[in-house]
């Protein structure tokens, strides 16, 4: 269980405005059981990106297919950019917990930067 | 075993309220979405509201929207679903039913239903 | 809404013949759709997840393809048990819509 990483393999991503960012995030193992989560930034500020746990984010998307078993690809796709989105963004392991699931591992984090719109 | 035991359903008047209940059993309730899903005799399925693991996310069908609320007692492994201002369209079998994780997941054990029947 | 297309709505075939039900979305739901078997008087029963993952305990006769707009459930060999409603829905965005289903009787 302690083996498990979580693997952000791009340092840093730049993306013009106005197109998708795509952040990629991989686990080495599908233990312990428990969802991802992507956050924009570090500590408590921190901003919820997605979860795979809850909710619909309409500007996110993942890259793979989450609901299918043995998945360890947990890269997302985010519409539309604007300069706003730019910062560091982490993917997060959290384990299944009672009664808060409890954060396990963090990616290294990516930073995201915008690049003006081309005219 | 998983079991979804709906009760609450009815015959209720125009106007009037009502509150059906669902009592998961058999897994972890507080790890999964729970939704509600009605059939009106005859008719198709119709998604009527969902409800995240933690009560974070909640979305209502148009249809409902303003009448209905949905919510959880995680405590208690319990679903509900409050409606309000009934109208005759809204006679239908109610299941609710469980989601794994996040919005994208397919609705994998329902409970068998329970009959709301509006009319004066 | 994403508008659910079933086709045919209903359906005469005979055990042992392959049925195809096909379901068409109104937009791009990625592989975000999901087939329901529903008995009279029953609630439905989750047979396809995600276009092609065939859910624990269902027979292997039932599978799925797509992806996209354009859906497919396929029977490959009839059995008297099989004779219901099936429908497609999609979990790719709010709200969740439903096929209007399609009935499948006996010949």
């Known amino acids: 269980e302690e083996g498990l990483q979580v693997i952000q393999p791009d340092k840093s991503v730049s993306v013009a405005a106005g197109e998708s960012a795509i952040l990629h995030c991989t686990a080495t193992s599908l233990i312990p059981v428990g969802p991802i989560q992507w956050f924009r930034g570090a500590g408590p500020g921190r901003e919820l990106i997605y979860n795979q746990k809850e909710g619909h984010f309409p500007r996110v998307t993942t890259v793979s297919d989450l609901t299918k078993r043995n998945n360890m690809d947990f890269s997302i796709r985010i519409g539309n950019i604007t300069p706003a989105d730019a910062g560091t963004y982490y993917c997060v392991k959290f384990r299944k917990g009672s009664p808060d699931d409890v954060e396990f591992k963090s990616g290294a984090g990516t930073e995201l930067s915008v690049r003006a719109k081309p005219s | 075993e998983v079991q979804l035991v709906e009760s609450g359903g009815g015959v209720v008047q125009p106007g009037r309220s009502l509150r059906l209940s669902c009592a998961a059993s058999g897994f972890t309730f507080s790890d999964y979405g729970m939704i509600w899903v009605r059939q009106a005799p005859g008719k198709g399925l119709e998604w009527v509201a969902s409800?995240?693991?933690?009560?974070?996310?909640?979305y209502y069908a148009d249809s409902v929207k303003g009448r209905f609320t949905i919510s959880r007692d995680n405590s208690k492994n319990t679903l509900y679903l409050q409606m309000n201002s009934l109208r005759a369209e809204d006679t239908a079998v109610y299941y609710c039913a469980r989601r794994y994780y996040g919005f994208n997941y397919p609705f994998d054990y329902w409970g068998q239903g329970t009959m709301v029947t509006v009319s004066s | 809404a994403i508008q659910l297309t079933q086709s045919p709505s209903s359906l005469s075939a005979s055990v042992g013949q392959r049925v195809t039900i096909t379901c068409g979305a109104s937009k791009s739901v990625r592989t975000y759709m999901h087939w329901y078997q529903q008995k009279p008087g029953k609630a439905p029963k989750l047979l396809i997840y995600?276009?092609?993952n065939l859910e624990a305990g269902v027979p292997s006769r039932f599978s799925g393809s797509g992806s996209g707009t354009d859906f497919t459930l396929t029977i490959s060999s009839l059995q008297p048990e099989d004779f219901a409603t099936y429908y497609c829905q999609q979990s790719n965005e709010p709200p969740y819509t439903f096929g209007q289903g399609t009935k499948l009787e006996i010949k």
């Open positions: 409800i995240s693991s933690s009560s974070s996310y909640i």
């Open positions: 995600s276009a092609s």
